[in-house]
C-alpha cells in the first residue's frame, strides 16, 4: 500500500487511510503505538482502504504502520505519524452564583496540562480571559454585574496544544442583597437616596422592619435610630415604649431598643452622632457599638471615639437603659425622672439626647456635654449605625 494518512483526529480517535496495493491482497496489517502506549495490531480485509483507530490516549504522538499480506508474502511497511488532540476538561459548572461573584469548577482532562484558559463573556459582549495553573480545578469569578447572563468557557493547554472548549451558562442574581439586613446593604444594592427603606433582620424576609436610611453622611449606609429636630414628639416615655420604638421615621422618632439589639447582634456596628445648632455642626463616631438584649436591660457598648463633638458617650459605656418606670442607673435618684428623658444613664449623664427639647435648664435638655455643655439644648440630633466594615463593602461595590 501507499499514501498512508490520518484524518479526523480527536483526543481519542483517528481515521487511517491508504492507497491499496496494485496487486490483489488478502489483508492489511495495521499497527500503532505511542509513547507509554503498548502497540496494538489489527488485521483488516484486503479490500479495505481505511480504518478507525479508537481508544487512543490524548495528547500523544502515535506511529502508525501498515503492510499488505498475500498468502505467505508480505509487502514493505509504510509509516505515518500523528498526534492526538488534547482532551477537554469536563463538567464545567457555575456554583455559588451571587450578584457579583460565581465559582467555576471543572474536572481535569486525562492528559497532563500546563494550564487552562478561562473565558467568560456577558450578554453585552464584555469578554474577560484568564489563564490558571495546571493543578487548578476551580476559579472564583469576581466583579461580575448583577442580573446578567454569562457564558463561561474553558480550554486545556499543554504547550502549543489546545483542547476543545467546553462551556456553561449562568445568570448572576439581581440584587447584591435581596433581603438587606441594614441600610449599608440597601445602599450596596444601589439605593443612594436618604429615606424610608425596608430592612430584614438577619436577612430573614419574615423579619421586616421599616427604617430611615441616611445615605449621604460620611459615605451613607446609616440606619437612623434617633432624631430630634423640633420638639413635636414626646420623648418622656416609659420602658415599653422605648423597647418597641415610637414616632414618625421621617420626623422625630426612636427606633426601639429591641430593634437596636437585633440589628447590632447581626455583626460589628459603628455609631455616628450628628449634632446641629444655630448653623454649627459636630459629630462623634464610635467604631464599636452594640445594645444588649432585654435580659441585660439593653446594656450599651460604645468604644473607639473619633470626631468633633467630644467623647461624651464614654461615660455611658457599659450602662443599662433607664426610663422613669424602670430605674437601672447607678444614682440614688432616678435619672430619667430627674432629667425628664431616657438613656443609658449612669449618675446621671454626659449625653441626654432624649431629654426635653428646647429646655436649657441644667441637664434637662437635649445635651451633649462636651460640645454644648448641660445648659444648652441642642436643636438637631441624630444617632445612627452601620457595619464597622462598611468601607470595605463599599469598595467592593465600586469595583463592580
Amino acid at each position: 500500500p501507499s499514501g498512508l494518512v490520518t484524518a479526523n483526529i480527536t483526543d481519542s480517535e483517528a481515521l487511517a487511510r491508504w492507497q491499496p496495493a496494485i496487486a490483489t491482497v488478502d489483508s492489511y496489517v495495521i499497527s500503532y503505538t505511542g509513547e507509554k502506549v503498548p502497540e496494538i495490531t489489527r488485521t483488516v480485509s484486503g479490500n479495505t482502504v481505511e480504518y478507525a483507530l479508537t481508544d487512543l490516549e490524548p495528547a500523544t504522538e502515535y506511529t502508525l504502520r501498515i503492510f499488505a499480506e498475500k498468502g505467505p508474502q508480505k509487502s514493505s511497511t509504510i509509516t505515518a505519524k500523528f498526534t492526538t488532540d488534547l482532551d477537554s476538561p469536563r463538567d464545567l459548572t457555575a456554583t455559588e452564583v451571587q450578584s457579583e461573584t460565581a465559582l467555576l469548577t471543572w474536572r481535569p482532562p486525562r492528559a497532563s496540562v500546563t494550564g487552562y484558559l478561562l473565558v467568560y463573556e456577558s450578554v453585552d459582549g464584555t469578554v474577560k480571559e484568564v489563564i490558571v495553573g495546571p493543578d487548578t480545578t476551580s476559579y472564583s469569578l469576581a466583579d461580575l454585574s448583577p442580573s446578567t447572563h454569562y457564558t463561561a468557557k474553558i480550554q486545556a493547554l499543554n504547550g502549543p496544544l489546545r483542547s476543545n472548549m467546553i462551556q456553561t451558562i449562568f445568570t448572576t442574581i439581581g440584587l447584591l442583597y435581596p433581603f438587606p439586613k441594614d441600610c449599608s446593604q440597601a445602599m450596596l444594592n444601589g439605593d443612594t437616596t436618604s429615606g424610608l427603606y425596608t430592612i430584614y433582620l438577619n436577612g430573614d424576609k419574615a423579619e421586616a422592619l421599616e427604617v430611615f436610611c441616611d445615605m449621604t453622611s460620611d459615605g451613607g449606609g446609616w440606619i437612623v435610630f434617633l432624631r430630634r429636630k423640633n420638639g413635636r414628639e414626646n420623648f418622656y416615655q416609659n420602658w415599653k415604649a422605648y423597647a418597641a420604638g415610637f414616632g414618625d421615621r421621617r420626623e422625630e422618632f426612636w427606633l426601639g431598643l429591641d430593634n437596636l439589639n437585633k440589628i447590632t447582634a447581626q455583626g460589628q456596628y459603628e455609631l455616628r452622632v450628628d449634632l446641629r445648632d444655630h448653623g454649627e455642626t459636630a459629630f462623634a463616631v464610635y467604631d464599636k457599638f452594640s445594645v444588649g438584649d432585654a435580659k441585660t436591660r439593653y446594656k450599651l457598648k460604645v468604644e473607639g471615639y473619633s470626631g468633633t463633638a467630644g467623647d461624651s458617650m464614654a461615660y455611658h459605656n457599659g450602662r443599662s437603659f433607664s426610663t422613669f418606670d424602670k430605674d437601672t442607673d447607678s444614682a440614688i435618684t432616678n435619672c430619667a425622672l430627674s432629667y425628664k428623658g431616657a438613656f443609658w444613664y449612669r449618675n446621671c449623664h454626659r449625653v441626654n439626647l432624649m431629654g426635653r427639647y428646647g429646655d436649657n435648664n441644667h441637664s434637662q435638655g437635649v445635651n451633649w456635654f462636651h460640645w454644648k455643655g448641660h445648659e444648652h439644648s441642642i436643636q438637631f440630633a441624630e444617632m445612627k449605625l452601620r457595619p464597622s466594615n462598611f468601607r470595605n463593602l463599599e469598595g467592593r461595590r465600586k469595583r463592580a
Epitope: 467623647d311 447607678s330 449623664h349 441644667h362 448641660h374
Partner: antibody, heavy 120, light 107 residues
C-alpha cells in the same frame, strides 16, 4: 494584679526639666485614660494632666499648661510626664492614676508616687 | 473651674461613732462626685464613685449620697483602720478638682 509604678522623680533646680514614667500592668492599658495627680508636702490633692486611651486627647491643669506634656506608649504600657521650666511650687509627690472614662474622670487605681523636689 | 468645699477640715471621732463628711460643689454637677481615703504615706484609694456607688472591696459601712451640689460621705461605725484623710473629687468637668480634705482622727 493591677499595678502602677512611678519613677523619674528627684531633686532638680528651678527652670530645669524632668521626665516622670509610670509602668502599668494587670489591665488592658490602651482601654483606659491615664492621669497624673500631685500632692505638695502636707497639702491636698491636685489633678495635673490626663490622656485618653489612644493618646489622641490630652488635658492639663492651668497651672502646668505649656510647661508639662503628658504622653503614653501603649506598646510598652507606659505613661510619661515631661516637666519643663520647673518651679518651686511644682514640688510634690506625683501619682500616676488609672482613669475609668476619660475627660472628667474617676481615679480607681493609684501608684505609690514619685517625689519631685524643685529647689536651688 | 469648679470649687469643691469640704467640711469639717478635721473631725476627731471615737471608734464606733457615726461619721459624716460633707462636700459642696460651686456649681451643679449631677452625681459626678467621688470620695477617696488617704492614709499617711500611702496613695489615695477610691471609696465611692458616682456619689453613691461603693467601689469593689470597700466595706459596707461606707456610703455616699447627694446630687447636684451637696454631697455626703458617711461611715456608719468608725473602725480603727478608718482613721485617715478623706477627699471628695468632682469628675463632672476638666479640670477635675478635689476638696481640701477632711482629717478623721482619734478622739
Amino acid at each position: 494584679q493591677v499595678q502602677l509604678v512611678e519613677s523619674g522623680g528627684g531633686l532638680v533646680q528651678p527652670g530645669r526639666s524632668l521626665r516622670l514614667s509610670c509602668a502599668a500592668s494587670g489591665f488592658t492599658f490602651d482601654d483606659y485614660a491615664m492621669h497624673w495627680v500631685r500632692q505638695a508636702p502636707g497639702k491636698g490633692l491636685e489633678w495635673v494632666s490626663g490622656i485618653s486611651g489612644s493618646g489622641g486627647s490630652t488635658y492639663y491643669a492651668d497651672s502646668v499648661k505649656g510647661r508639662f506634656t503628658i504622653s503614653r506608649d501603649n506598646a510598652k504600657n507606659s505613661l510619661y510626664l515631661q516637666m519643663n521650666s520647673l518651679r518651686a511650687e511644682d514640688t510634690a509627690l506625683y501619682y500616676c492614676a488609672k482613669g475609668t472614662v476619660g475627660e472628667g474622670d474617676t481615679f480607681d487605681i493609684w501608684g505609690q508616687g514619685t517625689m519631685v523636689t524643685v529647689s536651688s | 473651674d469648679i470649687q469643691m468645699t469640704q467640711s469639717p477640715a478635721s473631725l476627731p471621732t471615737p471608734v464606733g461613732d457615726r461619721v459624716t463628711i460633707t462636700c459642696r460643689a460651686s456649681q451643679y454637677i449631677q452625681g459626678f462626685l467621688n470620695w477617696y481615703q488617704q492614709k499617711p504615706g500611702k496613695a489615695p484609694k477610691l471609696l465611692i464613685y458616682d456619689a453613691s456607688n461603693l467601689e469593689t472591696g470597700v466595706p459596707s459601712r461606707f456610703s455616699g449620697s447627694g446630687s447636684g451640689t451637696d454631697f455626703t460621705l458617711t461611715i456608719s461605725s468608725l473602725q480603727p483602720e478608718d482613721f485617715a484623710t478623706y477627699y471628695c473629687q468632682q469628675s463632672y468637668s476638666t479640670p477635675q478638682t478635689f476638696g481640701q480634705g477632711t482629717k478623721v482622727d482619734i478622739k
